[in-house]
Each structure stands twice: as structure tokens, then as C-alpha cells.
């Protein structure tokens, strides 16, 4: 294309082509003609004396690029009840739907919208949600490694560490937190048979622990005296 700006339509010089981005070559007219901008379509093609005539796309229709389309494209149908609309249908872009929380996209469209959402898998007790996702976006579960646990069935909960106890009553395992012995002024005087209920872990107070490979000894072991449950809070 010559260096100077040339108004369409024009006949390209030998060895030159039309500007690809905003022009097209009309074989019938044998001219370089203007494409229509995003949001419009070709109402009338060009001829040797007059350029392309463009018109706005109608409601629920769009064109996203400079084009020589005879009609605008139809926007995708409305998002389903398990989806959220993250981009509305306009004259210049298609509607984009994404899966609501707790679901993943099992079938994507070429435009990046989601055609079919599926409920995320849940990881059961002893398993936590892995930091990476499956190729299809579903949750991956991983077994809680020693020193960590998950006592929930969830698509979001990760394995978290056992609490560190001042006095440990029952060691934690992959599906339960460590149980700490409660503080009592009489503990040192009374041999203790443990009836310690499992504290309900909460998001705001994950736990502390220390570990090692244990062949879990008898839970009725005498526990020594005095201590307090030391809980911890998640940093940040």
C-alpha cells in the first residue's frame, strides 16, 4: 500500500494489497473497500464509485472485529441458572457466561464462555483441595500428609496443620485435629482417663502441632499435669 493515506474505494497498484485490518478487496468491483467497524455490518457492498455502506447491529446481535459480514452474529443465549454473566451482549461483543461458585466449566465455547457447568468435586475427610486444578478446572483432592488434616467434605477446604497443644491428649491424624487436654488445677493430683471432646475447628483458628511418625499409643496414657489448650490463628 502506498505510504500516503488513500481513501476507499481505490484500485490497488500492481504488487500492493489492501490494508488487511480495515479494508478488503472486492473482487466484483476490483477495488480496495472499507470494512465495517465492530458493532456494524455491511448493508451495501462497495462499487467502483461508492464505498461500503455499514449499519449498526440490531439488538442481541454483534460483530467484534472489522468485518465485511452481511449480517451480525447472534449473541449466545442467556446464561443458565448455574452461571453468572461476566460480560453482557452488546453490539460489539458476545455475552460471556462463567460458572457460579462451587461449579467448574465442563464445556467451553470458542469465545471463552461456558456452555456447561458441573458441580465441583468434594474432598472428603482426610483429603484436602490441592493447590492446582484438573485440566478441566475441576477440584483435585490430595491426601493430607502427616501433621495435617481435613475433617470436612468440601470443594474448598485444604489440609491444615494440627494444633500444637500445651498438653496433647490425643494425637491428630489425617481426618481429625489433635485433641488438647484442658487446663485444670487438679490435673496433677488425679490420674486422667481422657474424655476429651474434639473441639470444632474453625476457619479463624487453625491449629498447631508437631509431629512424628507414631504408632499411636494408648489414649489412656497418664498425661502429667497442668496445661492449657494453645490454639493458633492463620497468619494474614
Amino acid at each position: 500500500v502506498p505510504a500516503q493515506v488513500v481513501l476507499t474505494p481505490y484500485k490497488p497498484e500492481p504488487g500492493y494489497e489492501c490494508q488487511i485490518s480495515q479494508e478488503y478487496y472486492d473482487r466484483k468491483a476490483q477495488m480496495c473497500c472499507a470494512k465495517c467497524p465492530p458493532g456494524q455490518y455491511v448493508k451495501h457492498f462497495c462499487n467502483k464509485t461508492s464505498d461500503t455502506v455499514c449499519a449498526d447491529c440490531e439488538a442481541s446481535m454483534y460483530t467484534q472485529v472489522w468485518n465485511q459480514f452481511r449480517t451480525c452474529l447472534s449473541c449466545s443465549s442467556s446464561c443458565t441458572t448455574d452461571q453468572v454473566e461476566i460480560r453482557a451482549c452488546t453490539k460489539q461483543q458476545n455475552r460471556v457466561c462463567a460458572c457460579e461458585a462451587g461449579r467448574y466449566c465442563a464445556l467451553k465455547t470458542h469465545s471463552g464462555s461456558c456452555r456447561q457447568c458441573m458441580r465441583l468435586s468434594k474432598c472428603g475427610p482426610g483429603f484436602g483441595v490441592a493447590s492446582s486444578r484438573a485440566p478441566n478446572g475441576n477440584v483435585l483432592c490430595k491426601a493430607c500428609a502427616p501433621g495435617t488434616f481435613s475433617d470436612t467434605t468440601s470443594s474448598t477446604d485444604v489440609c491444615r496443620p494440627h494444633r500444637i497443644c500445651s498438653i496433647l491428649a490425643i494425637p491428630g491424624n489425617a481426618s481429625t485435629d489433635a485433641v488438647c487436654a484442658p487446663e485444670s488445677p487438679t490435673l496433677s493430683a488425679i490420674p486422667r482417663t481422657l474424655y476429651v471432646s474434639q473441639p470444632e475447628p474453625t476457619r479463624s483458628q487453625p491449629l498447631d502441632q508437631e509431629p512424628g511418625p507414631s504408632q499411636t499409643p494408648s489414649i489412656l496414657t497418664s498425661l502429667g499435669s497442668t496445661p492449657i489448650i494453645e490454639q493458633s490463628t492463620k497468619g494474614g
Epitope: 496443620p161 496433647l168 491424624n173 489425617a174 512424628g212
Partner: antibody, heavy 129, light 110 residues
């Protein structure tokens, strides 16, 4: 709860020494690992070994400490660290520290979360001629 | 052998400022990382475990983060009492990997 080390001394190279860690306010046999960590003057921390204080008394050592250092549980409230063939490089404050155990299911012989949450004040061992 | 590389060796901060200490493991330790604070003449104190969990009584100005081989301790709103040496520790021990401490970072508060 507290831990206290004893037995630190000035000894000559080539000799042996036994350090004792005494627990107060809790029973060593209650699901704890008792560990030893040392710190040379003005230097960083160096893990030595741990012993599972319950029944089996399983131990694990830093590779450099195997053979020369031995941990054991002598009672429900005491653990010891025996050190042999001492050299000047062993001069350090020796701390005992504890970490608690957990069930490991299939993870036989594996210890992961060795978090030392309770420490003694330390005892100084000086090896010098 | 697992090596924990801690940087910087020393850092100075004004009261109210922020201190960042980095710890790099020579292999993936899967968040099994602890941070300790040690003051002269005292034993270390466990501040943070499993990379980001604060132990009981530790002020919320201490924050641990990181995963894999890279970990960070951040102290926001530094106070005079925070002057100490801080150590990271890989709490990952297995049949072929030993727990190891970083070299320490001295925090000086101006």
C-alpha cells in the same frame, strides 16, 4: 510446662559427656518427641536428634550425628543425649526441645512436621584442652 | 542434603516500619516451614508453623507466606521488642531429608 537441660561442662577433646533434659508439668511419654538442638557461640541452630518418648522409643538423627550421639528416654520425665569423642567443634549451647506426634497411617518411618514449640534454656558444653 | 538459605543476614528497620526476611529451600518442602525468634541468652521461640500459621500469643504483625521452595516472614509495624534473630526451619523430615535451619537474620530496630 517447661524443659531444663543439665550436664553441660568444660571437657577435654576426645572425652564423652551426657546431657539430661528434665520435663516439668507434663509426661514425656504422652505422645511427644524429645529433641536436641545445638548452637555454637554466635552461630545458628543445628538439629541433632529426636526420640519418640512413647513406648517404642524410635529415634532419628542428623546424618552428621549418627554414631557419636545417642538419645534415650531414661524416665517419664527425663531424656538424655550421650556425646562421645568430643572435639572443639562440639562447643555449643545444647537445647532440648519437644514436638508432638500424630498418627501417620501408611507413612511408616516418616516424620514431617518437626515444629519445636517448647524449649529448655540450654546448657553450655565447652570442649577445650 | 536439604539446605535452607536465609536472606538477608542482617536488616535494620525503624519503629513502625516493615521487615521482610526470605528463606529458600534447596528442594520443595511443601509448606513444612517454621519461623523462630531468638533473643540473646534465650532459647528460640516458635512464631509460625506450616508456613503461615501463627502460634498462640504471637502478634498479628507477624505474617508467614510462601510455598514450594520460597518462603517469607514479614513483620509489619515493627516494634522495639521485635529486635532479635529470626530463623527459618524446614520442618520436613523423611527417610532421605533432614530438618534444617536457615542461617538466621538479625533484626535491628532503630
Amino acid at each position: 510446662q517447661s524443659l531444663e537441660e543439665s550436664g553441660g561442662d568444660l571437657v577435654v577433646p576426645g572425652t564423652s559427656l551426657t546431657l539430661t533434659c528434665t520435663a516439668s508439668g507434663f509426661d514425656l511419654s504422652s505422645f511427644y518427641y524429645m529433641c536436641w538442638v545445638r548452637q555454637a557461640p554466635g552461630k545458628g541452630l543445628e538439629w541433632i536428634a529426636c526420640i519418640y518418648a512413647v513406648s517404642s522409643g524410635s529415634t532419628y538423627y542428623a546424618s552428621w550425628a549418627k554414631g557419636r550421639f545417642t538419645v534415650s528416654r531414661t524416665s517419664s520425665t527425663t531424656a538424655t543425649l550421650q556425646m562421645t569423642s568430643l572435639t572443639a567443634a562440639d562447643t555449643a549451647t545444647y537445647f532440648c526441645a519437644r514436638h508432638q506426634s500424630y498418627e501417620t497411617y501408611g507413612y511408616v518411618g516418616v516424620v514431617y512436621a518437626t515444629y519445636f514449640s517448647l524449649w529448655g534454656p540450654g546448657t553450655l558444653v565447652t570442649v577445650s584442652s | 542434603a536439604l539446605v535452607m538459605t536465609q536472606t538477608p543476614a542482617s536488616v535494620s528497620a525503624a519503629v513502625g516500619g516493615t521487615v521482610t526476611i526470605n528463606c529458600q529451600a534447596s528442594e520443595d518442602i511443601d509448606s513444612y516451614l517454621a519461623w523462630y525468634q531468638q533473643k540473646p541468652g534465650q532459647p528460640p521461640k516458635l512464631l509460625i508453623y506450616y508456613a503461615s500459621y501463627l502460634t498462640s500469643g504471637v502478634p498479628s504483625r507477624f505474617k508467614g507466606s510462601g510455598s514450594g521452595t520460597e518462603y517469607t516472614l514479614t513483620i509489619s509495624g515493627v516494634q522495639c521488642d521485635d529486635a532479635a534473630t529470626y530463623y527459618c526451619q524446614s520442618a520436613f523430615y523423611s527417610n532421605n531429608t533432614e530438618t534444617a535451619f536457615g542461617g538466621g537474620t538479625e533484626v535491628v530496630v532503630k
